[in-house]
């Protein structure tokens, strides 16, 4: 019997359990850089000495065609930075192989712009969101997610890449930011702090949340991540803040309960498929959006960031598990893996709702100073 080649994935192609690193934000070269001089971090903003995760291994994705199985895991090589040798940058081997992108850390040498010049760009991420300065943009419709509900088999790869914990997502998870703005999810990863120290990447009115989830997507206009890097809208990241709540979050527990198995840097495990959308807030209609960059090297710009207004609640125990279980390089704890906020440099953050008049994660005065750039859409 001949194996029918599935367009998205089929046995003969990539292991259904997800061996090879598909596009991951963490697997994209990371996005975080040491705090920049023009945006001195507050004490909270300075990650400790730990080597923390970023958005590094974003593998390539093949176009969807009738003849060829696209989005098979093994067909998703990781992304090389410009000038790097054409070898997959699997995080497990980065530090040992000595490629340029492997030698970066949070809050330490070398300066990120030396690792990747794009890290010194003018339109970087993360940023501080000031709701009262956001431009209300009625054209920003509710996000649409399709295919995010996964059966338990095949299992998915959960990996400690030394900079974050990353879940490699299978083909077929489709996301639309609006008509004609369609993407495919590649991977998700988290950013966190340490005991008593919040670790979200984005902030709201200067407030840093305990943690943040990033779901990284590739535009359907591109077949490979490296083609999309630096192109406006080539990549899109859905970001949500994680906060402490009274109850255990059952969706997150499916991942957090497995962290002990991957405590060591470079280790990975397989976890049953789950409802990926359950890891995000339920309100897909209220969010902030702006164009920025990856928050770890190569810090490629043109990334569309969508930050949910609603937060996700995890129990105190779950947040502690997240920040206190994994180890990074050099026998250091994997903590405080966030980049300092970057200057907007004239960028206007758009809001899908009248944020200046409403309560967003951290409410402010009801003033709307900026107008929607996409008002004509």
């Amino acid at each position: 019997q001949r194996l029918p080649r599935m367009q998205e994935d089929s046995p003969l192609g990539g292991g259904s359990s997800g061996e090879d690193d598909p596009l991951g934000e963490e697997d994209l070269p990371s996005e975080e850089d040491s705090p920049r001089e023009e945006d001195p971090p507050g004490e909270e903003d300075l990650p400790g000495e730990e080597d923390l995760p970023g958005e590094e291994d974003l593998p390539e994705v093949k176009p969807k065609s009738e003849e060829e199985g696209s989005l098979k895991l093994e067909d998703l090589p990781t992304v090389e930075a410009p000038g790097d040798p054409q070898e997959p940058q699997n995080n497990a081997h980065r530090d040992k192989e000595g490629d340029d992108q492997s030698h970066w850390r949070y809050g330490g040498d070398p300066p990120w712009p030396r690792v990747s010049p794009a890290c010194a760009g003018r339109f970087q991420s993360p940023v501080d969101i000031r709701p009262q300065l956001a431009a209300f943009c009625p054209a920003l419709r509710p996000l649409e997610l399709l295919g995010f509900q996964l059966p338990p088999l095949p299992e998915l790869r959960l990996r400690n890449n030394g900079h974050s914990v990353q879940l490699t997502l299978p083909p077929g998870l489709e996301m639309a930011l609006g008509p004609g703005r369609e993407y495919r999810a590649l991977q998700l990863h988290l950013h966190w702090g340490a005991a008593g120290r919040p670790g979200s990447e984005h902030t709201v009115e200067g407030h840093r949340f305990p943690a943040e989830i990033h779901v990284v997507h590739l535009s359907t206009a591109f077949a490979r991540v490296d083609e999309a890097l630096g192109r406006p809208g080539g990549l899109a990241v859905l970001a949500a803040f994680l906060e402490e709540g009274p109850e255990e979050n059952s969706a997150y527990e499916q991942l957090l309960s497995r962290l002990e198995e991957i405590a060591e840097e470079g280790s990975e495990t397989q976890v049953p498929g789950l409802d990926i959308s359950a890891l995000l807030p339920s309100d897909f209609s209220r969010y902030f959006q702006y164009e920025g960059s990856l928050t770890t090297p190569p810090c490629a710009q043109g990334v569309i960031w969508t930050v949910f207004n609603q937060t996700v609640m995890l129990s105190a125990k779950q947040l502690h598990t997240l920040s206190d279980t994994l180890w990074g390089p050099g026998d250091s704890r994997l903590q405080l893996n966030f980049r300092a906020t970057q200057p907007l440099n004239g960028r206007v953050i758009e809001a899908s709702f009248p944020a200046g008049v409403d309560s967003s994660p951290r409410a402010a005065e009801p003033v709307q100073l900026n107008s929607c750039l996409a008002a004509g859409d």
Epitope: E8, P11, L153, S277
Partner: antibody
Framework: QVQLVQSGGGLVQPGGSLRLSCAAS????????MSWVRQAPGKGLEWVSA????????YYADSVKGRFTISRDNSKNTLYLQMNSLRAEDTAVYYC????????????WGQGTMVTVSS | QSVLTQPPSVSGAPGQRITISCTGT?????????VHWYQQLPGAAPRVLIY???NRPSGVPDRFSGSKSGTSASLAITGLQSEDEADYYC??????????FGGGTKLTVL
């Protein structure tokens, strides 16, 4: 060539046991979750059991829970179904199938093996 | 009784278009899980016809298409041919931790 070759079917008395085997070739067996699906004579398809790629997680239909055991030997590229306390209603053609598709589809099927439970 | 409901039989003349429905509940199709379709020719093992609601494996003619909406899904076959005569099954996943099938639909080409 991608294929799943089954063996082990036959006639067994009620209360008896039988072990089905499914030998995989042409694809990296150890990377894929696998399932057993059965089809009673003249009836439709019924999922029986599933196992993760590394064998660490198993799933069973309520109708066989506690009686059937799914297992795999990745070094031999072989999937097994140990069937105990067999009943007349277990009579069916049993197919092994590959859970290789991320969307939850079974994309490679064995040729099927007949299990008849009768006194 | 099957978890997913299909009509027992459908028929059509060569060249015609037919559809086969598959109705589930809020714990399977309605929960967001994908629907897959299989064709089983007499005496043979099933083969995937449509996966992920509307994707065709290579080798499957574009006369076959799938769609999904709410708690139901459907398989459409256009330009019906005699070799399409077979049993067709829909399949999804259910929150009860099981993979579920429809009862099957016998397609007769008149």
């Amino acid at each position: 060539q991608v294929q799943l070759v089954q063996s082990g079917g036959g006639l067994v008395q009620p209360g008896g046991s039988l072990r089905l085997s499914c030998a995989a070739s042409g694809f990296p067996f150890s990377s894929y979750a696998m399932s057993w699906v059965r089809q009673a004579p003249g009836k439709g398809l019924e999922w029986v059991s599933a196992i993760s790629a590394n064998g660490g997680t198993t799933y069973y239909a309520d109708s066989v829970k506690g009686r059937f055991t799914i297992s795999r030997d990745n070094s031999k590229n072989t999937l097994y179904l140990q069937m105990n306390s067999l009943r007349a209603e277990d009579t069916a053609v049993y197919y092994c199938a590959n859970n290789g598709n991320y969307r939850g589809a079974f994309d490679i099927w064995g040729q099927g093996t007949m299990v008849t439970v009768s006194s | 009784q099957s978890v997913l409901t299909q009509p027992p039989s459908v028929s059509g003349a060569p060249g015609q278009r037919i559809t086969i429905s598959c109705t589930g509940t809020s714990s399977n199709i309605g929960a967001g899980y994908d629907v897959h379709w299989y064709q089983q020719l007499p005496g043979a093992a099933p083969r995937v016809l449509i996966y992920g609601n509307n994707n065709r494996p290579s080798g499957v003619p574009d006369r076959f298409s799938g769609s999904k909406s709410g708690t139901s899904a459907s398989l459409a076959i256009t330009g019906l041919q005699s070799e399409d005569e077979a049993d067709y099954y829909c399949q999804s996943y259910d929150k009860s931790l099981s993979w579920v099938f429809g009862g099957g639909t016998k397609l007769t080409v008149l």
